[in-house]
């Protein structure tokens, strides 16, 4: 009983349940391959519980191992379009601080119009994740086609 | 020690560890694009701990943020078959209650024979998830090729 | 306060937070379709917290339901290469003990150069997971393109 009470009284954040699911806001200007994300209940089913957005990029607030997942669908796309515009590549990485810059997850579209993947990775407080889409095709902004999220798994 | 004892005595369900992994049972009749799922240890490696099946559709029993994942492979499929029958699309959504109806996850097969993805989404007790496969190809019923699951992540 | 202290004093392993993320070490000799994995902070962002490697294969140390995920990218690959070398197939399964041998997850590359998926599955202490890549193409050893991991979810 004591445990149950204690559990209810502790803020969820202290249990390390940091989690975020983001929807695409917009793409960057021409020389900027980054996707810019947004989240919050006012926008639909996206949310941030712990992590924050910094100019459309996801910033981590708690050290730990995270499950990072992403799906990106190209807009007005067919397998012909996708192969014609190859290579179109999506990379998720730590882009700041610069000392920790690294690519975590990379996929090419080849003859498909959607990529989806996930991985476990250690992240530290202050790490900012960037998602770079290189190529000449636009990502869909439909919330069921393009999304990006993280889930704290353990310290 | 007290914490460890308390933790052991609490039923898992009270910790909010709702989880389910389902295998394909059958497709719907002609005008019904829904996939009908089944789960339970007698069937192999599928299971339901918390959520329930309602006429082959997954019903949520606990409010929270869930990781939803799915893989669907088309039967007797080649890249030629898949491209010829485009668009073949898989959508996962809340189909009831009607007031909460929304598409959560959508993918097209294009020139591939398998789609796989996952996302975090808030779900409420009573939400029923439907998986709609539109197109003229059959989904594989092999349990390592087609499956659908949810995992409660946090309140 | 008592709860927070108790939680800090318990080793993480006792909470059942077994988790591993591996990077590709090498492929097997000609008649061996298995991929051989490696993990550890000295290698980059891979790690093993609970599970162990046994001759490059992942061995489970704790009974429970696990989220298993994988991404494999073929080296020097285009959609033409992939379709020409079809079928190239990736299967994740329990390969020992022999009595529990089963395929858990299977995907073909068709005209793509990357597969990625995930699923929930019960695993038992001593289960060894093997990842079999059949076909004549090499997997990429880039750590952001090819990886394999498990996460303990619940008992």
């Amino acid at each position: 009983q004591r445990f149950a009470q204690a559990q209810q009284q502790l803020p969820l954040e202290s249990l390390g349940w940091d989690v975020a699911e983001l929807q695409l806001n917009h793409t960057g200007p021409q020389q900027d391959p980054r996707l810019y994300w947004q989240g919050g209940p006012a926008l639909g089913r996206s949310f941030l519980h712990g992590p924050e957005l910094d100019k459309g990029q996801l910033r981590i607030h708690r050290d730990g191992i995270y499950m990072v997942h992403i799906q990106v669908t190209l807009a007005i796309c067919s397998s012909t379009t996708a192969s014609r515009h190859h290579p179109t590549t999506l990379a998720v990485g730590i882009c700041s601080p610069a000392s920790r810059s690294i690519s975590l997850l990379r996929l090419s579209f080849h003859q498909g119009c959607t990529i989806a993947s996930q991985r476990l990775t250690p992240l530290a407080r202050g790490d900012t994740l960037c998602t770079n889409l290189t190529g000449t095709l636009l990502p869909s902004r439909n919330t069921d086609e393009t999304f990006f999220g993280v889930q704290w798994v353990r310290p | 020690q007290r914490f460890a004892q308390a933790q052991q005595q609490l039923p898992l369900e009270s910790l909010g560890w709702d989880v389910a992994e389902l295998q394909l049972n059958h497709t719907g009749p002609q005008q019904d694009p829904r996939l009908y799922w089944q789960g339970g240890p007698a069937l192999g490696r599928s299971f339901l701990h918390g959520p329930e099946l309602d006429k082959g559709q997954l019903r949520i029993h606990r409010d929270g943020i869930y990781m939803v994942h799915i893989q669907v492979t088309l039967a007797i499929c080649s890249s030629t078959t898949a491209s010829r029958h485009h668009p073949t699309t898989l959508a996962v959504g809340i189909c009831s209650p009607a007031s909460r109806s929304i598409s959560l996850l959508r993918l097209s097969f294009h020139q591939g024979c398998t789609i796989a993805s996952q996302r975090l989404t808030p779900l409420a007790r009573g939400d029923t998830l439907c998986t709609n496969l539109t197109g003229t190809l059959l989904p594989s019923r092999n349990t390592d090729e087609t499956f659908f699951g949810v995992q409660w992540v946090r309140p | 306060q008592r709860f927070a202290q108790a939680q800090q004093q318990l080793p993480l392993e006792s909470l059942g937070w077994d988790v591993a993320e591996l990077q590709l070490n090498h492929t097997g000799p000609q008649q061996d379709p298995r991929l051989y994995w490696q993990g550890g902070p000295a290698l980059g962002r891979s790690f093993l917290h609970g599970p162990e490697l046994d001759k490059g294969q992942l061995r489970i140390h704790r009974d429970g339901i696990y989220m298993v995920h994988i991404q494999v990218t073929l080296a020097i690959c285009s959609s033409t290469t992939a379709s020409r070398h079809h079928p190239t197939t990736l299967a994740v399964g329990i390969c020992s003990p022999a009595s529990r041998s089963i395929s858990l997850l299977r995907l073909s590359f068709h005209q793509g150069c990357t597969i990625a998926s995930q699923r929930l599955t019960p695993l038992a202490r001593g289960d060894t997971l093997c990842t079999n890549l059949t076909g004549t193409l090499l997997p990429s050893r880039n750590t952001d393109e090819t990886f394999f991991g498990v996460q303990w979810v619940r008992p």
Partner: antibody, heavy 120, light 111 residues
Amino acid sequence: QVQLKQSGAELVKPGASVKMSCKASGDTFPRYNMHWLKQTPGQGLEWIGAIFPGNGETSYNQNFKGKATLTADKSSSTAYMQLNSLTSEDSAVYYCARNSYYDYAWFTYWGQGTLVTVSA
Amino acid sequence: DIVMTQSPASLDVSLGQRATISCRASKSVSSSGYSFMHWYQQKPGQPPKLLISLASNLESGVPARFSGSGSGTDFTLTIYPVEEEDAATYYCQHSREFPPTFGSGTKLEIK
């Protein structure tokens, strides 16, 4: 309900060619393979080949390559089969057929058949 | 090509009794959790009519006295109880790969 209406019976001379048609009702014509089958008392039912009207792609039974040519006209929802260099062995009833919902090679809908008689 | 061996070639069954027709494929026609085996009925002067798809799925409008079973290479069509109107020739067919092939047929006569 899809209906497949085939052209009428043909009496042709050996060495000649024949082209028969199969008109489909409904608007799903481009999305399903149209299959052609041959039936004789001696050989039973044999699959000749199929055409996917959406893009004109064809697949043939090796035994009928060079004998049959499949085409389709999306605008009129009509599939055609031409048989050339006819011999008495080509005398048969020819059917067009397709599936109702899943586009695999089992056949819910059949035409009424076109009888081809090859005779001098 | 997969060879379909159907037996018997002909069958005489009394009204109300059970008719059983067998079909054996030269290799497995099961894939992806389905058996790609189908059964047709044909009456003189008519095209074949699909009775059962995917080994056991009864087509719409087909009476419940028709049933199919089997997997892998061995399949059975059962009609029970047989009625007068069931007199016809029955064919099995696989669609596991190209080309699809048919059995040679079983002629069912009602005594």
